[in-house]
């Protein structure tokens, strides 16, 4: 349907493919791509070659190509400013001549290894109350955090560490729509030096 918007996730500096999925390539005469401005025109190549792309905006020069036979569009070397709405006006021999496909391109950084910050809050009867905070280097959008083995969600984990839990390893997994990465801390490290009281510990 013309009204549907297809979300496409891309990774900063890498490539993304807009799925046009033309079923009958012979039908296609031209596809006009627009975003904030005109982006490119795609026309059929010779019978055995990929479609021909004419880039119409300097921001996209040498970064766009189209794949045969389905006319999927590829933007490479993605930049943050590439994010936004895209429209493909597909002109074919079939009625109604021109149909429109709409896309929303979201661009994310590939997540680096997260850091676990440890804060010892209190220690009573060989049980210590520890807060673990997991964070990625740059403040990123759409990042979710998960802790194992507890299955807790969110970037902050509060634990009450007992001697029996010494063999546990706590792993934080940070995830966004295009990547995930993890860091771990062993339970032994958490309350190793109670005498020092409150402290912050960075792993990695």
């Amino acid at each position: 349907k013309d009204s549907e918007i297809f979300t496409v996730n891309g990774i900063l500096g890498e490539s993304v493919t807009f799925p046009v999925n033309i079923q009958e390539p012979r039908q296609v005469k031209i596809i006009a791509w627009t975003s904030k401005t005109s982006v490119a025109y795609v026309t059929p190549g010779d019978s055995e070659t990929a479609p021909v792309v004419t880039v119409t905006h300097r921001n996209y020069y040498e970064r766009i190509h189209a794949l045969g036979p389905n006319y999927n569009l590829v933007i490479s070397d993605l930049r943050m400013e590439d994010a936004g709405d895209y429209k493909a006006d597909i002109n074919t021999q079939a009625d109604p001549y021109t149909t429109t496909k709409r896309y929303n391109l979201q661009i994310y950084r590939r997540l680096g290894k997260p850091k676990i910050t440890q804060s010892l809050m209190a220690s009573v009867n060989s049980t210590c109350n520890v807060t673990l905070t997991c964070s990625v280097e740059k403040e990123e959008k759409n990042v979710t955090y998960n802790w194992s083995p507890l299955g807790e969600e969110g970037n902050v984990l509060q634990i009450f560490q007992t001697p029996e839990d010494q063999e546990l390893t706590y792993t934080c997994t940070a995830q966004n729509p295009v990547s995930n990465n993890s860091d771990s801390i062993s339970a032994r490290q958490l309350c190793a030096d109670i005498a020092m009281g409150f402290r912050t510990h960075h792993t990695g």
Epitope: R26, T56, N91, Q93
Partner: antibody
């Protein structure tokens, strides 16, 4: 309703050029390719080329590549075809037609006569 | 370029009978989904009129006595029953590739 308006006739001298026009109305001009077709008595129909108004993208029949130049003026919804270095064999009826691959709408044609 | 050969070059058919016009392409103009062949009618002093698109699909407003068939390289236009007003020249045209080409035309006369 859809209309493609063409001048009725042009009389031109050999070696000169002529610019034929095709004014479209009654439909979204940008969505349809403007095609040009040549008709000579006893020779049938020949497709010259087409142009897409949105982008100015053109396709030409190799036979007419040096003879015809297609342009559009989207502000006036007009397609144009310039014929250069005119000779007697260019005397013909020239139609514009709109459509993608097939031609649903036609102008009445412009009769070009090349005569000294 | 794809050459379209129409036959016969002319034919005369009695009123109410069937007229059959053939168009043969020098190479296939069909995929598994579509045949890229179209038919036009041209009357004297008028531009061509699209009758049939994609080998067998009747264009809007065209009488049902016109029908098209065929695929690959062989296509047929049938008119049945023919009427007086069907006196015209009929052309086939492919849109398989650039350049589009037309057949040489078939002149139909009603007896």
């Amino acid at each position: 309703q859809v209309q493609l308006q063409q001048p009725g006739a042009e009389v031109v001298q050999p070696g000169t050029s002529v610019k034929l026009s095709c004014k479209a109305s009654g439909y979204n001009f940008t969505n349809y390719w403007i095609n040009w077709v040549k008709l000579r008595p006893g020779q049938g129909l020949e497709w010259i080329g087409d142009i897409y108004p949105v982008s100015g993208t053109t396709n030409y029949n190799e036979k007419f590549k040096r003879k015809a130049t297609l342009t559009v003026d989207t502000s006036s919804s007009t397609g144009n075809m310039q014929l250069s270095s005119l000779a007697s064999e260019d005397s013909a009826l020239y139609y514009c037609a709109s459509g993608t691959g097939r031609f649903a709408y036609w102008g009445q044609g412009t009769l070009v006569t090349v005569s000294a | 370029d794809i050459v379209l050969t129409q036959s016969p070059a002319s034919l005369a058919v009695s009123l109410g009978q069937r007229a059959t016009i053939s168009c043969r392409a020098s190479q296939s103009v069909s995929t598994s989904s579509y045949s890229y062949m179209h038919w036009y009618q041209q009357k004297p002093g008028q531009p061509p009129k699209l009758l049939i698109k994609f080998a067998s699909n009747l264009e809007s407003g065209v009488p049902a006595r016109f029908s098209g068939s065929g695929s690959g390289t062989d296509f047929t236009l049938n008119i049945h029953p023919v009427e007086e007003e069907d006196t015209a020249t009929y052309y086939c045209q492919h849109s398989w590739e650039i350049p589009y080409t037309f057949g040489g035309g078939t002149k139909l006369e009603i007896k």
